[in-house]
Interface confidence: medium
């Protein structure tokens, strides 16, 4: 088969849009199964068409309904015979516009005054293309050939900026670049103490506006009294809009405000938020825990706790818990310094503990009480006798039969 | 004159493998590409899938790859259509149409000019 | 996948002008063609490659198409061109073709 493409140029230039046929002519074979190849790649375009001229001389055709600059590139058309592939000689295809933009300006946020850069590169075919630079309505820079780049020496308020491209075919424009000031930013809100212990406080606020350009950082200022002396000063970087504020006195009244910087500067400080440290935990537990065996019951009592500073406050309920070793336990408060207890086995050994408790939550657990089962078979010991046993810490929690003065911590009272 | 035989209206039950035909005439069959389209009843027309002229080629709509097999006998210029198992869905008329190709005239030719009279397969159990 | 988009339903009075719309993303870069197809009977063409009229059709079918929109137009509808009309293109990389859901066209 002898294959040469018929009645095209070996360049070929189509303006964009504009309908293309390419022809291929096969000789010496009577059905030929012309494919179209481009740029290495067969065609799977069902645009294919073949006239047969006589028995042995066929034309295909490859048709493009609206070239476009994708379709530019190197095609040929080929052929199967005897089980080898006869390629054409090939077709340069260009496709001619206006311009196509490769880079168009981008927007920017700039310091008042500050020089600035944007670029414009766009190609054809068909070259040279050339860049006009464009200032709202304005031209302010060209013709220059592509690429170009608008040096600017500053603006002073938000400037629109474009470029034009420009060859044989015409004229394209770019898109408008927005060339924004940047500014102080604006003051933080919704500031929040998160988290509030005896001597830390977890803050937590909105950014306000960035003014443009990146925050870095925010200052949380903190004072005993809005306007007085700073106690504490700490600079965080940002994001996470969160700062953790350590080694503050417990049941003390603060104010704190917070203020974001930028490149330029820092914000306005946000409003004073005053909050205020919890107090200690009592320091103290209760002395001399004791069970008192009645007829009802059992009355535990204790020494009451006096306060050891004005930074516990007021010392409120105690708290009794109790456990015993077939797993019951329970908790009460108590206003006093006595308890009467109810609701337990007395066939089974008694641990009992106390602590006292203020608006912070509990102290120090008092030393564990065991009352042992022993103490209440067949109502032994006369009605009104003290006993009691203080606990060594760190006795095995596991036995399970125990003399009258055996004595055993829970692992429930482990702290 | 061209004409394209269609073979005859066929009932079936789902899963059931069915293959039906396209017999061309008054043209050289390698001078054109068949194309199948399918019409479910009162509803539109849908293209299925061709095959080139030298049926060494076939194309298929995104709906009816692997569900459709088209093939063609060139020694006796006939396309089929082939279903290895039916579904009710596929209850339809089905036409073969002579696509694009060669004329003598030596101009490029119409495309789907010439429409087979139909083949009307029913599933149903 | 690849969809053409054709009204459901267009009605003119006799003597009036139908046109009948198809949209699709490739028909810049793909042809047109659009079918008749009355109660019954195996379609017809009517316009292929976007204007070409096929032979035997009356002059008053005409095709055009702009961007991404074929239209087929027909000049001083008359009953008998009552029917169903399909437009037909193909996907833009031109593996497949499609057909427009059709638009029954009523002459009143």
């Known amino acids: 088969a002898g294959l040469k493409l018929m009645g095209a140029p070996v360049k070929l230039t189509v303006s964009q849009g504009q309908p293309v046929k390419l022809n291929c002519s096969v000789e010496g074979m009577e059905e030929p199964d012309i494919q179209w190849v481009k740029d290495g790649a067969v065609v799977q375009n069902l645009d294919q068409l073949y006239i047969p001229v006589s028995e042995q001389h066929w034309i295909g055709f490859l048709s493009l309904k609206s070239a476009e600059r994708s379709d530019a590139g190197r095609y040929w058309c080929q052929v199967e015979d005897g089980g080898e592939t006869e390629i054409s000689q090939p077709v340069w295809l260009t496709v001619e516009g206006v311009p196509f933009f490769t880079v168009e300006p981008k927007d920017l946020a700039v310091p008042p005054n500050a020089p600035f850069q944007l670029s414009c590169e766009a190609v054809g075919p068909p070259e040279p293309v050339t860049i006009v630079w464009w200032r709202g309505t304005t031209k302010i820079g060209g013709p220059a050939p592509s690429p170009s780049v608008l040096n600017v020496t500053g603006v002073t308020q938000s400037t629109m900026f474009s470029c034009e491209a420009h060859n044989l075919k015409g004229l394209a424009s770019s898109r408008t670049a927005t060339v924004h000031l940047q500014a102080l930013p604006a003051a933080p809100f919704n500031v929040t103490v998160t988290k509030l212990s005896s001597s830390n406080a977890s803050v937590a606020w909105m950014p306000g506006a960035d003014g443009r350009a990146l925050l870095q950082s925010c200052t949380v200022q903190v004072t005993q009294a809005p306007g007085g002396w700073e106690v504490l000063a700490v600079v965080v970087p940002v994001p996470p809009f969160t700062c953790l504020l350590r080694d503050l006195v417990p049941a003390t009244n603060y104010s704190l405000r917070v203020r974001c910087a930028n490149a330029l500067g820092p914000s306005p400080y946000a409003d004073w938020v005053p909050f205020q440290t919890k107090g200690l935990a009592p320091a103290s537990a209760p002395q001399n825990l004791h069970a008192i065996r009645t007829d009802s019951g059992l009355i535990l009592e204790w020494e009451e706790v006096i306060p050891e500073g004005p930074l516990e406050g007021p010392l409120g309920p105690y708290k009794l818990s109790w456990v015993q070793d077939n797993g019951t336990q329970d908790e009460l408060t108590v206003e006093g310094t006595r308890a009467n207890l109810t609701g337990w086995d007395p066939q089974k050994d008694l641990i009992v503990r106390v602590c006292v408790s203020n608006a912070v939550g509990c102290g120090p657990w008092s030393q564990p009480l065991v009352v042992s089962s022993h103490d209440h078979a067949g109502q032994q010991g006369p009605p009104h006798s003290r006993t009691s046993w203080l606990v060594p810490r760190g006795s095995s929690a596991h036995h399970h039969h125990h003399h009258h003065h055996s004595a055993w911590s829970h692992p429930q009272f482990e702290k | 004159e061209v004409q394209l035989v269609q073979s005859g209206a066929d009932v079936k039950k789902p899963g059931a493998s069915l293959t039906i035909s396209c017999q061309a005439s008054g043209y050289t069959f390698t001078d054109y590409w068949i194309s199948w389209v399918r019409q479910k009843p009162g509803k539109g027309l849908e293209w299925m899938g061709q095959?080139?002229?030298?049926?060494?080629?076939?194309m298929y709509g995104p709906s009816f790859q692997g569900h459709v097999t088209i093939s063609a006998d060139r020694s006796t210029a006939t396309a089929y259509l082939q279903w290895r198992s039916l579904e009710a869905s596929d209850t339809a008329m089905y036409y073969c149409?002579?696509?694009?190709?060669?004329?003598?005239?030596?101009?490029?030719?119409?495309?789907?000019?010439?429409w087979g009279p139909g083949t009307l397969v029913t599933v149903s159990s | 996948s690849y969809e053409l988009t054709q009204p459901p339903s267009v009605s003119v009075s006799p003597g009036q002008t139908a046109r009948i719309t198809c949209s699709g993303d490739?028909?810049?870069?793909?042809?047109a063609y659009w079918y008749q197809q009355k109660s019954g009977q195996a379609p017809v063409l009517v316009i292929y490659?976007?204007?070409k009229r096929a032979s035997g059709i009356p002059e008053r079918f005409s095709g055009s198409s702009s961007g991404t929109m074929a239209t087929l137009t027909i000049s001083g509808a008359q009953v008998e061109d009552e029917a169903d009309y399909y437009c037909?293109?193909?996907?833009?990389?031109?593996?497949?073709?499609?057909f427009g859901g059709g638009t029954k066209l009523t002459v009143l």
């Open positions: 037909y293109s193909q996907e833009r990389k031109g593996n497949y073709f499609v």
């Open positions: 490739a028909l810049p870069k793909k042809y």
């Open positions: 149409v002579r696509s694009g190709g060669a004329t003598s005239g030596g101009t490029i030719p119409e495309y789907y000019q010439h």
């Open positions: 490659e976007d204007w």
């Open positions: 095959i080139n002229r030298h049926a060494s080629n076939t």
